[in-house]
């Protein structure tokens, strides 16, 4: 008996078409994506074949101007015109709190959502019960697959979950809901979620009982064969992962934002073994029409965003200093204020012990595009914004040794002077360089903002301790020349759209006045 | 659970036809086709034919002049039909799921006078 | 229609020994290859399907390997329970079986 698995992750906001790198759609002849066009695929496989399934794997949520605007309805209406099959919750459908999920999504979805390690208790749990499921048991066919959910038990730090949601470990949690489906004699089990690649492999191995593992979180890349776009495949698709007790058990994911399709097709004997496993993702590129119905919806939707992008956020009462010649050769303002706004972003009070989690942020100023004049009655719009942030990129939790937070520093100044955008912008760090220094040696003082303490003060860097940063998916992924950060990083999590993170800060505060004021010497 | 159980004649005399059933629990037929399979005593085991999922059905080409296989969807049931039985047919008859991952316990059916 | 070709066809060895039964197919069957055994009184299982996944309650003394054309079977530690006749069976087209291994007390 054969399956096809379509499978998402990771869409974040990607409801239009996008450019090749996930950006804002230029050239409509080049664009990828969108969920016109994903239906136009999905469809496509719908008719040519029996059974089956299109899951995601979370991560819907947060990512361009659509999240900001329409806060999770539109995932549900369009996920429902796709007919998604279930959904895996992910770290960032809880980016506008519990009731952000409930409302929007889980109360529109027609479609099951599933976490089988996320346990409600309190007065939540009576509110929320029966709108999430650990597992759900689909008809496919003159067959049933078990679908068990899972989320990064990470949420808590990389979103805003409450205090009334426990996120248990993945596979205590898995197991028995897994023995549960296998008391119900459902022998085809799919683990569906978003913890990671090495999560997803980890569950593939230890969880008896599953089948295949759709995943997300990760963004990873999986392909057999030569690539069809940029993206680099982190291994053969599907992944290939022995179970402790003797099963070869695929993984899969699909990479991110919509840009490609997962397709695989599994094989299954009559105990619901895998017997094969085969596929690839499928690029969604402008060989593939749009859908002319979903097109129209997208377009009728798209009205609001359009009145949205000119209305004032709250206003500077300071000139908002973005300029090429401040941020790439000093502390600017702009970049003080975006630093601010990512640690901002990021309060999570989930231990005593703590005042933050996370206290330091580093950007890179070329990556601030462009000031904003105080002297347009001081309004801030998102228009304003996305001239500053206009990659559509995200600001990502990642933890690095203070070795690697050293060298960045040292990086940053290592050519100063030729206007080059790898001069950093900071917050929760004070640095002070000699620039009359060799190259490498620049950094005479690099101070930090203390997490474990009630009282935030700086301390110096110690280079054997590992510290969390905010920083732009670009220097994540050794943007910049910033390989180091790339190639030591200990942990990263993606984040939330750059724009509106600064865009939340401005209307929280609603008058903003960000000074230089020593941060970088 | 998975089972396969074949039931039929113990004995079958020469030029008869045997008729055996193989009934299905646990998994359907609908999804799922059947092996049929014989090993003569002492002997090694040889492939006799199948049923697909779809009604469709495949034969051992030393076979195909005399045997047919059908089944009843609604009742779990697979039967196999071999016409012209020699002594040489004496076997055990196994029925076992399409991918072998379940078998039938086997019946030893005798053809003698 | 494909071929299989068992060997050894039969093998004496004692409890603790590591036992290796090889099958080479007439062409390349892509992995889908099976081995069961079969206990005296006649009873079919399947302990390995798809060339190295070990069928459920199957201990993890046996295990499977191969590609293209050449399959192996492999019990690491012989225990009494495990002297028996073994079996390869591709399923790539119709169904064949290899010879057989019975695998004796020394």
């Known amino acids: 008996w054969e399956l096809t698995i379509l499978h998402t992750n990771d869409v974040h906001s990607r409801l239009e078409q996008t450019s090749e790198d996930s950006s804002k759609c230029v050239n409509a002849s080049r664009c990828m994506g969108g969920v016109a066009r994903l239906f136009t695929k999905v469809q496509q496989i719908r008719r040519a074949e029996p059974n089956v399934l299109l899951l995601d794997a979370g991560d819907q949520y947060q990512g361009t101007i659509w999240f900001t605007v329409y806060k999770g309805a539109e995932v549900a209406h369009f996920m429902n015109a796709l007919r998604y099959d279930a959904m895996a919750l992910g770290n960032h459908e809880f980016d506008n709190g519990v009731e952000g999920l409930i409302e929007p999504l889980l109360k529109e979805a027609k479609f099951p959502i599933l976490s089988a390690n996320i346990k409600a208790k309190g007065p939540l749990a009576s509110q929320i019960s029966g709108l999430y499921l650990p597992y759900k048991v689909l008809p496919v066919g003159d067959e049933v697959v078990g679908i068990v959910g899972y989320t990064s038990k990470e949420t808590p730090f990389l979103s805003n979950p409450g205090t009334n949601l426990v996120f248990e470990d993945e596979i205590t949690a898995l197991q028995p809901e897994v023995d549960k489906l296998k008391t119900l004699n459902v022998n085809k089990i799919i683990a569906l979620g978003h913890s990671g690649f090495e999560m997803d492999k980890l569950i593939a191995q230890k969880v008896r009982g599953v089948d295949v593992v759709v995943g997300g979180h990760s963004n990873t890349f999986l392909y057999t064969g030569n690539p069809p776009s940029k993206e680099v495949p982190a291994g053969k698709y599907p992944f290939i992962v022995t179970s402790d007790d003797g099963r070869k058990v695929p993984v899969v994911q699909a990479y991110a934002f919509g840009k490609y399709l997962g397709y695989l097709k599994i094989e299954f004997d009559e105990r619901g073994n895998v017997i094969s496993s085969h596929g690839n993702p499928i690029l969604l590129n402008s060989s593939i029409p749009e859908d002319p119905s979903i097109k129209a919806d997208i377009n009728k939707w798209r009205i609001k965003l359009d009145n949205y992008s000119t209305q004032e956020l709250g206003k500077t009462i300071v000139y908002l200093d973005g300029s090429s010649q401040s941020c790439r050769f000093r502390e600017c303002n702009m970049g003080n204020l975006i630093c601010d706004a990512m640690i901002n972003n990021n309060l999570r009070h989930t231990d005593e012990m703590f005042w933050n989690h996370v206290s330091m942020c580093i950007l890179n100023g070329g990556g601030i595009r462009s000031p904003i004049d105080e002297r347009n009655n001081g309004t801030i719009t998102w228009e304003n914004l996305a001239a500053v942030l206009p990659f559509g990129g995200t600001f990502d939790l990642v933890q690095l040794k203070g070795s690697t937070l050293k060298k960045a520093f040292e990086h940053s100044v290592h050519r100063y002077g030729q206007s080059t955008g790898e001069f950093l912008q900071v917050g929760g760090i004070h640095v002070v360089y000699d620039l009359s220094r060799k190259p490498g040696d620049r950094v005479v003082k690099l101070d930090v903002l203390c997490t474990k303490c009630r009282v935030p003060s700086y301390d110096p860097l110690k280079m054997d301790e590992v510290y969390k940063v905010i920083l732009p998916n670009f220097l994540a992924n050794g943007g910049d020349g910033f390989q180091m950060i790339k190639d030591e990083l200990l942990r990263h999590d993606s984040g939330d759209q750059d724009i509106n993170v600064v865009s939340t800060y401005i209307s929280k505060m609603k008058v903003i006045y960000p000074a230089v004021e020593g941060r970088i010497k | 659970e998975v089972t396969l159980k074949e039931s039929g004649p113990v004995l079958v005399k020469p030029t008869e036809t045997l008729t055996l059933t193989c009934t299905v629990s646990?998994?359907?037929?609908?999804?799922?086709?059947i092996q049929w399979v014989r090993q003569p005593p002492g002997k090694l085991l040889e492939w006799l034919g199948v049923?697909?999922?779809?009604?469709?059905?495949d034969y051992n080409a030393a076979f195909i002049s005399r045997l047919t296989i059908s089944k009843d969807t609604s009742k779990s049931q697979v039967v196999l039909t071999m016409t012209n039985m020699d002594p040489v047919d004496t076997a055990t008859y196994y029925c076992?799921?399409?991918?072998?991952?379940?078998w039938g316990q086997g019946t030893l059916v005798t053809v003698s006078s | 229609d494909i071929q299989m070709t068992q060997s050894p066809s039969s093998l004496s060895a004692s409890v603790g020994d590591r036992v290796t039964i090889t099958c080479r197919a007439s062409?390349?069957?892509?992995?889908?290859l099976n081995w069961l055994q079969q206990k005296p009184g006649g009873a079919i299982k399947r302990l390995i399907y798809?060339?190295?996944s070990l069928d459920s309650g199957v201990p993890s003394r046996f295990s499977g390997s191969g590609s293209g054309s050449e399959y192996t079977l492999t019990i690491s530690s012989l225990q009494p329970e495990d002297f028996a006749d073994y079996y390869c069976?591709?399923?790539?087209?119709?169904?064949?079986f290899g010879g057989g291994t019975k695998v004796e007390i020394k």
């Open positions: 646990g998994f359907s037929l609908k999804s799922y086709g």
């Open positions: 798809a060339t190295s």
């Open positions: 076992a799921g399409q991918y072998g991952s379940v």
């Open positions: 062409q390349d069957i892509g992995d889908r």
């Open positions: 069976l591709q399923y790539a087209g119709s169904w064949t």
């Open positions: 049923i697909w999922s779809g009604g469709s059905a």
